[in-house]
């Protein structure tokens, strides 16, 4: 089973842009696109800070801690309205995700 | 370095629920997926079910009416459940740490077994 | 459910040979197949993972390959402790199946 040019396998993504911006004080505003190829019943996601195919029923609860976002030894948490998670890292920087 | 200890009776009667936790140390229970395996005697591997930190499941099909898994974050550890046992469900059971590396899930810790035996 | 399909089911070897044992899925699973060891009375130790990826503190004699439906688990230069059963796994659906194990003993 060969995979042609540019075409991913099964259950996996590619970055395909990323910007960052550092305008504001101690803040840096990072957006990444991403091309996933996933199987029946996933959807593009993030696991461990890397864009993954993940369980669709994450997406649809909203549980998003159970894509396991964030980096080994990184703590996860719901925002407020599950509107997000936040990453707290162990010596308390906090890296807050947005899903939109 | 992350551990995992398998406890719960040996033996349970049949038509009984058959009982087991995991208790993660070295390591935080939030931060993977947990995965109960069974092996009955002189047999191969059978996958019973997933948790996932919020308590979410996925069973396998052939035990879903009776499994059960329950996540204890407060106590780093995960339970499995199997009700109305009989004799086929005598087996060792681990319980493993479920890793995805990159897009590939595996299970890269396991627990050292406990024998559950079925009989009255 | 995928079936897993291991053959095969035992092999006898002697120590420094090289041994292949193959492993078929029902339906494509890409590249999301794992390999695990067993010696008896232990748990599974896992060995290999995504088809080809060696995991960490396994010894470099062991490699896998394969996509697809059709893989295998290479063993170059067999040690006494490299006798045990292996399966292999998938892991690209639910529910998680393994193959039915293949014996590696002594020759």
């Known amino acids: 089973q060969f995979l042609k040019e540019g075409q991913l396998a099964a259950g996996t993504c590619e970055v395909i842009a990323a910007h960052r911006d550092s305008s504001q004080p101690r803040r840096t505003i990072a957006r990444q696109t991403a091309r996933c190829a996933c199987r029946k019943g996933q959807i593009a996601g993030t696991t461990r800070a890397r864009p993954a195919c993940v369980d669709a029923r994450i997406i649809k609860t909203k549980q998003w801690c159970d894509m396991l976002p964030c980096l080994e030894g990184e703590g996860c948490d719901l925002l407020i309205n599950r509107s997000g998670w936040t990453c707290t890292q162990p010596g308390g920087r906090i890296k807050t995700t947005t899903v939109s | 370095q992350v551990q995992l200890q398998e406890s719960g009776p040996g033996l349970v009667k049949p038509s009984e629920t058959l009982s087991l936790t995991c208790t993660v140390s070295?390591?935080?229970?939030?931060?993977?997926?947990w995965s109960w395996i069974r092996q009955p005697p002189g047999k191969g591997l059978e996958w019973i079910g997933y948790i996932y930190p919020s308590g979410s499941t996925n069973y396998n099909p052939s035990l879903k009416s009776r499994v059960t898994i329950s996540v204890d974050t407060s106590k780093n550890q995960f339970s499995l459940n199997l009700k109305s046992v009989t004799a086929v469900d005598t087996a060792v059971y681990y319980c493993a740490r479920v890793n995805p590396f990159g897009y590939y899930y595996a299970m890269d810790v396991w627990g050292q077994g406990t024998t559950v035996t079925v009989s009255s | 459910d995928i079936q897993m399909t291991q053959s095969p089911s035992s092999l006898s070897a002697s120590v420094g040979d090289r041994i292949t044992i193959s492993c078929r899925a029902s339906q494509s699973i890409s590249t999301s197949l794992n390999w695990y060891q067993q010696t008896p009375g232990k748990a599974p130790r896992l060995l290999i993972y995504?088809?080809?990826t060696l995991q960490s503190g396994v010894p470099s004699r062991f490699s896998g390959g394969g996509s697809g439906t059709d893989f295998s688990l290479t063993i170059t230069s067999l040690q006494p402790e490299d006798f045990a059963t292996y399966y292999c796994q998938e892991s690209a659906s639910i529910p998680r199946t393994f193959g039915q194990g293949t014996k590696l003993d002594i020759k």
């Open positions: 070295g390591g935080s229970i939030s931060s993977y997926y």
């Open positions: 995504g088809a080809s």
